[in-house]
């Protein structure tokens, strides 16, 4: 029976050109984490292997660097980087768990100004 | 043009171990994953385990740990499997094959070598 | 570990017959799959990596489908050259296991 849970950091927004961290947090299972895959749409970003270690997709080898921990840093945001991004948990013996965020890519000034009403 | 050349066939008692060679040519060595298959007279294919030749690190299946090691050599572009403990099952022959894309997950194996009779017999 | 079943375990054509393999994985392997080819006494050959992605001087006549669990390699005009086992494999998840594999007689 899978008892885990996957915790995400949600919704999140980011300023064009910056960088965000994409991280989640597999809780409540003793099961092993075999690998970690992290994805965008159907496109893989990122594996994380328990044996081998880090892989970056050759074609986002410049714009994404592992870590921190099982996480994701994004880097050099464009507009085009708006979407869903997918963690997807390989785990012994429970099987899969998948997390979901979505990121918002904003303009600079966008950004600026959405940040002067967060509520602290 | 890319080459695996593995070392010649081996024959040994139960119990013992062997070492098997594949030795990389004409592309960069370190760039690309190698895995060990092995099959068996008249039966499938059997995935070992793979070796990044850049940092040594290895994934095995759990059928071969503690039975098997992965090295390799990147002054003479030589990876080696050694299997221990040797049975009668572990008669097949032993393939290396490289992974099809440099410096990525490896997809699939796109360069094999041609392969090592290994015959286990008392 | 990911279970690897192919059917049929082996199937009888002519020449010219369109051939039609299937692979099921135990669990979604998304689009992370193999197919070789092996002729006796010789080292296996990729035809298609990525499920649908035919490798570098693989005739065209050779194609692959599918995602998550089920996956088809189909070879549109069976040629002399063909008769041969055919294999999948999945890339998502070490150990990365072979299908019990198909093999391919004239009729």
């Known amino acids: 029976m899978m008892t885990g849970t996957i915790e995400t950091t949600g919704n999140i927004s980011a300023e064009k050109g910056g960088s965000i961290i994409l991280q989640c947090h597999l809780s409540s299972t003793t099961a092993q984490v075999t690998q970690v895959n992290w994805e965008q749409q159907d496109q893989l970003l990122a594996i994380c292997n328990a044996d081998l270690g880090w892989h970056i997709s050759p074609s986002f080898k410049d714009r994404v660097a592992p870590g921190p921990g099982l996480g994701l840093t994004l880097q050099s945001l464009t507009v085009n980087d708006t979407g869903e991004y997918f963690c997807i948990y390989h785990t012994y013996p429970d099987g899969t768990y998948t997390g979901r965020i979505f990121l918002e890519v904003l303009e600079s000034s966008v950004a600026e100004h959405g940040a002067r009403f967060q509520i602290p | 043009q890319v080459q695996l050349v593995q070392s010649g066939a081996e024959v040994k008692k139960p119990g013992a171990s062997v070492k098997v060679s594949c030795k990389a040519s004409?592309?960069?060595?370190?760039?690309?994953?190698m895995s060990w298959v092995r099959q068996a007279p008249g039966q499938g294919l059997e995935w070992m385990g793979i070796?990044?030749?850049?940092?040594?690190?290895?994934s095995f299946a759990q059928k071969f740990q503690g039975r098997v090691t992965m090295t390799r050599d990147t002054s003479t572009s030589t990876v080696y499997m050694e299997l221990s403990s040797l049975r009668s099952e572990d008669t097949a022959v032993y393939y290396c094959a490289r992974a099809r894309y440099p410096e990525s997950w490896p997809y699939g194996m796109d360069v094999w070598g041609q392969g090592t009779t290994v015959t286990v017999s008392s | 570990d990911i279970q690897m079943t192919q059917s049929p375990s082996s199937l009888s054509a002519s020449v010219g017959d369109r051939v039609t393999i299937t692979c099921r994985a135990s669990?979604?392997?998304?689009?992370?799959l193999n197919w070789y080819q092996q002729k006796p006494g010789k080292a296996p050959k990729l035809l298609i990596y990525?499920?649908?992605s035919l490798q570098s001087g693989v005739p065209s006549r050779f194609s692959g489908s599918g995602s998550g669990t089920d996956f088809t390699l189909t070879i549109s005009s069976l040629q002399p050259e063909d008769f041969a086992t055919y294999y999948c494999?999945?890339?998502?998840?070490?150990?990365?296991?072979f299908g019990g594999g198909t093999k391919v007689e004239i009729k």
């Open positions: 669990q979604s392997i998304n689009s992370y």
């Open positions: 004409g592309y960069t060595f370190r760039s690309y994953y």
């Open positions: 990525a499920a649908s």
């Open positions: 070796i990044d030749p850049s940092g040594g690190r290895t």
């Open positions: 494999q999945q890339s998502l998840l070490t150990p990365f296991t």
